[in-house]
Interface confidence: low
């Protein structure tokens, strides 16, 4: 048996993916361990095996099928159990009724690139990826610019409330190098949440002309 | 390979209670949907209850509602089979069965099987 606190949280990313994340006080030693997937109205189920992140907490993703079919709706419940092998039999140390489309976390937004750069300002795209259709134009993204000298942490969140898959970032310094980060969020779910961040797009902004003011 | 083993059967007066037991080896558990069947002598092997494999969805044959209750504990691999109000005419052999196919677990012979505990209700 083992003790201590249990907590399992996982996310759908609208499309054919479930990760989930289990940690538990009482850390297992050399123990297998699975997550299981059971939808309550399809005839698939499917399971992923836990692996170690850190020293009491295992992750796994759920594939439920091609990247971008649409698995899963808004009325399914997908009964989700942590499992652990005990000698021969396998135990179930949590278990949960998971609703998809209250829990989502969307894919990292992909494909940034500088549409256009000046002197104090670059215009920047991205695309969403796996993201359901059911969302239509309900999307929201968080976006962020490290200048040298600072870090991620610092730097302040520029939030755009509708589904916009580009940016103009202004008022920046020439001749400078910068990165970029995007995350997306649907609009709809309790237990939603952001996605993870994009890759870094690093740009530099162009020089000043010489013999000009900037 | 999947062995089911059944226990509680025997001997009880009409009105009296039995809480039949079945435990699964050899596989996850919850990857299974359980039943019970029952066979009576000179008579076909029919379904009698089942539960899904979380739980949350029962299945009874109208002789049985109300009076027999299907449940699963997913902790110790074992369904059970509680049986209230029993009659004479429930005498039979119970089976406990298992299909990884929840729409399939009514189908004779595409479940796996037990092997069967004998169910007397006197009268």
């Known amino acids: 048996a083992v003790n201590g606190t249990s907590q399992f949280t996982c996310f759908y990313n609208s499309r054919a993916n479930i990760s989930c994340v289990w940690s538990q006080d009482g850390a297992l030693q050399d123990t297998s361990c699975q997550v299981h997937a059971w939808p309550d109205r399809r005839r698939w189920n499917q399971t992923c095996e836990l692996l170690p992140v850190s020293q009491a907490s295992w992750a796994c993703n759920l594939i439920l099928g091609a990247p971008d079919s649409q698995k899963l709706t808004t009325v399914d419940i997908v009964t989700l159990r942590v499992l652990c092998r005990e000698g021969v039999r396998w135990r179930v140390m949590a278990i949960q009724d998971f609703k998809p489309f209250e829990n989502l976390r969307l894919m990292a937004p992909i494909s940034l690139q500088v549409v256009h750069v000046e002197t104090h300002r670059c215009n920047i795209s991205w695309e969403i990826s796996q993201a359901s259709h059911y969302f239509e134009r309900h999307l929201e993204f968080e976006a962020r610019t490290l200048s040298p000298g600072h870090t991620w942490e610092e730097a302040p969140l520029l939030t755009l409330k509708q589904k916009q898959e580009w940016i103009c970032l202004e008022t920046l310094t020439p001749d400078t190098q910068y990165e970029f980060q995007v995350r997306v969020k649907p609009l709809q779910g309790e237990f939603t949440t952001w996605s993870p961040w994009s890759q870094p797009l690093a740009f530099r902004t162009k020089p000043a002309a010489l013999g000009k003011d900037t | 390979e999947v062995q089911l083993v059944e226990s509680g059967g025997g001997l009880v007066q009409a009105g009296g209670s039995l809480r039949l037991a079945c435990a699964l080896s050899g596989d996850v558990f919850v990857r299974y949907t359980m039943a019970w069947f029952r066979q009576a002598p000179g008579k076909e092997r029919e379904f009698v209850a089942s539960v899904t494999d979380s739980g949350r969805t029962t299945d009874y044959v109208a002789s049985v509602q109300g009076r027999f209750t299907v449940s699963r504990d997913n902790n110790k691999n074992t369904v059970y089979l509680q049986m209230n109000s029993l009659k004479p005419e429930d005498t039979a052999v119970y089976y406990c069965?298992?299909?990884?196919?929840?729409?399939?677990?009514?189908?004779?012979?595409?479940?796996?099987w037990g092997q069967g505990t004998q169910v007397t209700v006197s009268s």
């Open positions: 069965a298992a299909n990884t196919d929840y729409f399939q677990i009514r189908s004779l012979d595409r479940n796996t």
